[in-house]
């Protein structure tokens, strides 16, 4: 026999199927020019050593069969003994190791069967009532195909399925959308009412992600609050990666989860702007506020669950570097500048109470007065800090007050508010007798103790009713009582507590006379 | 006052190297991601590489066309950032830009140093 | 990459008129793009970030909107120190690119 013809004579080789799970597969047949045919097919197992045959029956019953040695491809002209204008049986023989393994037969009239191309280029993917779709253009001069879809997810063997008849420039596929997991599609098409036409070859992969992006898993740790104010927020634990079917692995565009960070300022209401959206791979500075961060998991079918955390503001307080004074018409606060150009968000809420009750107000941007120092005054008829109270005050800065992450710290501390010389009078002054020339001096701690660092000190004094003469003791912020020696008995005196703060003197408590009895000796 | 001031351009030929320099001012340079965007003459703004802050790994990333070539470093104690450009072509005559990184806290701009590749 | 697609490339105006320009960008970018203003000879000067908020010290005839993938770059009232070129830049994803351009001139 002529190698370029085919053969009509028995094959050299053993005429029995092995039955083994090895040997040629997927054999495509069509026409590649006016006279020209081609078949390719694929060889699965190894390949040391093997001969494929195509072989080829005719409808009379007539068999043949060409050598193709070792390829996989073989081609064949019109004058080659196949009759290609009616319909034939064809299917690849492969001798190897002793043994003939067979394809799965293929039949179709080869003058009307055309190469058909899987879908190429770009093949959208978009959700449609719970189903992904998919949409390509039609290969050129393609029009009127057969489509065929394969789908597999990292843990589950290929799945068949079926697109239907396509008859358009454009073709499209619904096909099954998995909730949690990835998957691989591929594509392939065949020509559209031309019996037996073969398979184009599959597509090149097509990777969806889960119609639910992951929930992020990771946690957040923040740095402690730095000179100037700001703390890092740093990512302990990478989110989670998809795990991918085998096609998908390295490059799978489409897959990706996108992880975004959400940043809500929960301190300072009164600022511009509250949230941020960033990327999660750059960790901002954050102030000492308290803050939520949201990690919102995004795919090409939209958000997902996102996992939110709270940042607690950073308590730390600064007990001398705010200075308050208090005159006829209304407050002033002064505290360091941090630079040219600031403006700065003072915010207070009464101690005890929830985070929601804080009252804020917004600075004009400020430089520094001539001796470095920024201020913030409010009138009595304000209402601000107006309470007989301790107040918690932080006093934020930024040099760009609509940029979430430029806001900084600068100090915070209490603040009693009100009256605060008279509400911090020390109440139930009282005296007992100690000794025969001292008395202990009790009083009920001041409203000003309840304020950490602003009672800076207790003042007692002592007054002797005979010489008017007048001695005053400072007590520590901590106690509450006080040994007055040196007395004489029989004298009258007046003794009275005050409390005062780093900036402000108290108001004296009520005179209380007391005099120590003469001890009359027996 | 925030400052990047490039330094290192001038005329070179083809296949020759050339290092730019942008010395930054006025802000926390360790903090910040650094990038090098360039604009060859009467064209449109052109990514060529970014430099993430040591704390974020310090790693870096370039554009397509100058990986390979171009390499971005950063010397905190100095306040600078560089960009050494090797094997270069003539496509790659432009004003090189440093700037921060978009999206981080500032969005600033060098004034830009021209680099000329010609024989 | 993300392609970034600029429209139109250039554009003439009178002075008080309402200026837009587009930039639409190949995939989803959430709201991480900027437009930058650049004048001949100079850096480009940032406008607007996350899409839609004003840098400081920019004019408010300046604005921002658009997500995903559909932005716009608006200046309500065309001045005539706006002439320039101006660009948009997403930041989601490396490579940054950068739209082609809108050369705005005055009629």
């Known amino acids: 026999c002529r190698t370029s013809e085919c053969c009509f004579q028995d094959p050299p080789y053993p005429d029995a199927d092995s039955g083994s799970a090895s040997g040629p597969r997927d054999l495509r047949c069509y026409r590649i020019s006016s006279d020209r045919y081609e078949c390719s097919w694929q060889y699965e197992g190894p390949t040391a050593g093997v001969s494929h045959f195509l072989r080829c029956c005719l409808s009379s019953g007539r068999c043949c069969y060409f050598a193709a040695g070792s390829a996989t491809r073989l081609q064949f002209s019109d004058q080659a003994g196949v009759s290609v204008l009616y319909t034939v049986t064809l299917w690849v023989e492969s001798w190897a190791r002793n043994q003939t393994e067979k394809s799965p037969e293929v039949t179709l009239q080869l003058y009307n069967s055309v190469k058909y191309e899987p879908p190429l280029g770009d093949i959208k993917v978009s959700k449609l009532a719970g189903q992904l779709r998919m949409e390509w253009e039609t290969p050129d001069n393609q029009v009127g195909a057969e489509v065929q879809f394969r789908h597999r997810t990292p843990s589950s063997p290929w799945k068949l399925g079926d697109c239907g008849p396509q008859d358009d420039d454009t073709e499209s596929c619904l096909c099954p959308l998995e909730m949690n997991v990835a998957q691989e599609f591929q594509l392939r098409r065949r020509q559209l009412g031309s019996q037996g036409s073969s398979w184009s070859k599959w597509s090149s992969p097509v990777c969806v992600p889960p119609e639910n992006p992951p929930q992020p898993q990771v946690r957040f740790s923040v740095e402690q609050l730095g000179q100037d104010g700001r703390r890092r927020l740093t990512l302990k634990e990478q989110p989670t990666q998809l795990e991918l079917p085998e096609g998908c692995q390295g490059l799978a565009p489409g897959t990706e989860v996108t992880y975004r960070l959400q940043l809500h300022m929960l301190s300072c209401p009164c600022k511009a702007k509250a949230t941020r959206t960033l990327h999660l791979g750059k960790m901002p500075y954050l102030s000492g506020a308290a803050y939520n961060v949201a990690v919102i998991s995004s795919n090409q079918f939209g958000p997902g669950l996102n996992q939110t955390w709270h940042i607690p503001a950073d308590t730390h307080t600064e007990p001398v570097a705010l200075n308050i004074s208090v005159g006829t018409n209304g407050t002033t606060m002064y505290w360091p500048a941090r630079a040219q150009s600031m403006t700065y968000c003072i915010e207070w809420q009464p101690v005890g109470q929830d985070g929601g009750l804080a009252t804020c107000s917004l600075t004009a941007p400020q430089d520094p007065d001539p001796a470095g120092m920024a201020t913030y005054s409010w009138s009595r008829e304000s209402g601000a800090m107006g309470q007989e109270k301790c107040y918690y005050i932080t006093i934020f800065a930024s040099a760009h007050p609509e940029k979430l992450t430029l806001w900084s710290t600068v100090l915070s501390t209490y603040h009693f508010g009100g009256n605060a010389s008279a509400a911090g009078t020390p109440h139930h002054v009282s005296v007992k007798n100690h000794s025969l020339d001292s008395v202990s001096v009790d009083w009920a701690p001041s409203l000003l103790s309840t304020c950490p660092g602003v009672l800076k000190e207790y003042v007692v004094r002592c007054r002797d009713e005979d010489s008017k003469q007048v001695s005053e003791h400072p007590v520590q912020p901590t106690e509450t009582q006080v040994t007055l020696s040196g007395l004489r008995a029989g004298v009258a005196y007046t003794v009275q507590v005050r409390a005062d703060t780093a900036w402000l003197r108290g108001v004296w408590s009520q005179p209380q006379r007391f005099s120590i009895e003469v001890q009359v000796s027996d | 006052e925030v400052q990047l001031v490039e330094s290192g351009g001038g005329l070179v030929k083809p296949g020759g190297s050339l290092r730019l320099s942008c010395a930054a001012s006025?802000?926390?340079?360790?903090?910040?991601?650094m990038n090098w965007v360039r604009q060859a003459p009467g064209k449109g703004l052109e990514w060529v590489g970014r430099?993430?802050?040591?704390?974020?790994?310090?790693?870096?990333d370039y554009a397509a066309p100058v990986k390979g070539r171009f390499t971005v470093s950063r010397d905190d104690p100095k306040n600078t950032l560089y960009l050494q450009m090797n094997s270069l072509k003539t496509e790659d005559t432009a004003v090189y830009y440093c700037?921060?990184?978009?999206?981080?806290?500032?969005?600033?701009w060098g004034q830009g140093i021209l680099v000329t590749v010609s024989s | 990459d993300i392609q970034m697609t600029q429209s139109p490339s250039s554009l003439s105006a009178s002075v008080g008129d309402r200026v837009t320009i587009t930039c639409q960008a190949s995939?989803?970018?959430?709201?991480?793009l900027n437009w930058y203003q650049q004048k001949p000879g100079k850096a480009p000067n940032l406008l607007i970030y996350?899409?839609?908020d004003l840098e400081t010290g920019v004019p408010s005839r300046f604005s921002g909107s658009g997500s995903g993938t559909d932005f716009t770059f608006t200046i309500s009232s065309l001045q005539p120190e706006d002439i320039a070129t101006y660009y948009c830049?997403?930041?989601?994803?490396?490579?940054?690119?950068f739209g082609g351009g809108t050369k705005v001139e005055i009629k």
């Open positions: 700037t921060t990184d978009p999206g981080w806290e500032f969005d600033y």
């Open positions: 006025g802000f926390t340079f360790s903090n910040a991601w």
């Open positions: 430099i993430k802050s040591k704390t974020d790994g310090g790693t870096t």
């Open positions: 995939q989803d970018i959430s709201n991480f």
């Open positions: 996350d899409a839609s």
């Open positions: 830049q997403q930041y989601d994803n490396l490579p940054l690119t």
